[in-house]
């Protein structure tokens, strides 16, 4: 399987909220001994590999933001801890999972990574990740709503 990032760049005004999204593509094993671990973190475009460094999102680590379930179940994170930080990560039945960040500030700008670990008990872990950039802007040049740029082209879409 692979992870797709529908949008590679999100440009948002301060105070707005944004939902960063990743999607699992390809065959997903739903066997008894296969489970999935999904999470989010901030990173940098490192020398070794993008997303290899794991930094907290608003002081929440990737452990705090993880989703854990079998291949066909929906899930969301512990609401209390995440929501106190204006965050919520969630996953649906169709392989899409996301993190929503409320009340954006300039400090939220940076590279965000989603990580999916397919755990084949008795065999191995298979990791895949996706990366996307968030730019939070302020002032007269800031958009009124988030503008997202698809990964496949440079066309932009307005998110209201």
């Amino acid at each position: 399987f692979k992870v797709a990032t529908p949008y590679s760049l999100y440009v948002c005004p301060e105070g707005q909220q944004v939902t960063l999204t990743c999607r699992l593509l390809g065959p997903v094993d739903k066997g008894h001994d296969v489970t999935f671990y999904k999470t989010w973190y901030r990173s940098s475009r490192g020398e070794v590999q993008t997303c290899s460094e794991r930094r907290p999102i608003r002081n929440l680590t990737f452990q705090d933001l993880h989703l854990h379930h079998g291949g066909h179940q929906a899930a969301n994170t512990s609401h209390d801890l995440a929501q106190r930080h204006g965050l919520e990560s969630a996953s649906d039945h169709h392989g899409q999972f996301s993190i929503t960040m409320r009340n954006l500030t300039l400090l939220d700008s940076g590279l965000y990574c989603c990580l999916v670990v397919e755990i084949r008990h008795h065999h191995s872990e298979h990791r895949v990740h996706g990366a996307m950039e968030l730019q939070v802007q302020t002032g007269k040049d800031a958009p009124s709503n988030c503008v997202v740029y698809p990964s496949s082209s440079q066309d932009s879409e307005n998110i209201t």
Partner: antibody, heavy 117, light 107 residues
């Protein structure tokens, strides 16, 4: 802050079953892998196996025929049973939290188990 | 299973010196390698994950490098509390395996 505490007898007779329990406090046991590792005197660390929060288990092939790891989520505990022990099973036994695609990040302080008649 | 070989077995150094510890894998583990520190009577403590990322609260004098089969843990300037045994561990597949350890002792 998550903390782990091993408990169980410090002395087991040869051919008997070693039984240890790890109590998880300060956090949920309903995530991650919960692992057992041991360190025989004068030797290195050896991974015994884990139980995943979902109930799936995975054991070191070198010990698989003798190992059972179980979990009691209502008590926030997971347990190790090692049957038919010999003197070679004398070791400090550690329980640890293992996070997928990460590492063994939190360990218990360890409990010494001696196999002797 | 993947065998991890650590060298040297013992490293005798003085405080303030640089320590370089090696871990070699019998087959590629990509960068899925961790380093732990263990002091007598204590549990191992996670230092480095994914070959080069410091775990939370680990001082900057500890750094990891390498990928594939050859890895290095470097302690840039030894502090008195750094004298301990260091283990590498792979997690590219199960069973998880550890190296035999390198003891860093005071010269």
């Amino acid at each position: 802050q998550v903390q782990l505490q091993e408990s169980g007898p410090g002395l087991v007779k040869p051919s008997e079953t070693l039984s240890l329990t790890c109590t998880v406090s300060g956090g949920s046991i309903s995530s991650y892998y919960w692992s057992w590792i041991r360190k025989p005197p004068g030797k290195g660390l050896e991974w015994i196996g884990y139980i995943y929060y979902s109930g799936s288990t995975n054991y070191n092939p070198s010990l698989k025929s003798r190992v059972t790891i179980s979990v009691d989520t209502s008590k926030s505990q997971f347990s190790l049973k090692l049957s038919s022990v010999t003197a070679a099973d004398t070791a400090v036994y550690y329980c640890a939290r293992d996070i997928p695609a990460f590492a063994l990040d939190i360990w218990g302080q360890g409990t010494m188990v001696t196999v002797s008649s | 299973e993947i065998v991890l070989t650590q060298s040297p077995a013992t490293l005798s150094l003085s405080p303030g010196e640089r320590a370089t510890l090696s871990c070699r894998a019998s087959q590629s583990v990509s960068y899925y390698l961790a380093w732990y520190q263990q002091k007598p009577g204590q549990a191992p403590r996670l230092l480095i994950y994914d070959a080069f990322n410091r775990a939370t609260g680990i001082p900057a004098r500890f750094s990891g490098s390498g990928s594939g089969t050859d890895f290095t843990l470097t302690i840039s300037s030894l502090e008195p509390e750094d004298f301990a045994v260091y283990y590498c561990q792979q997690r590219i597949n199960w069973p998880l395996t550890f190296g035999g350890g390198t003891k860093v002792e005071i010269k």
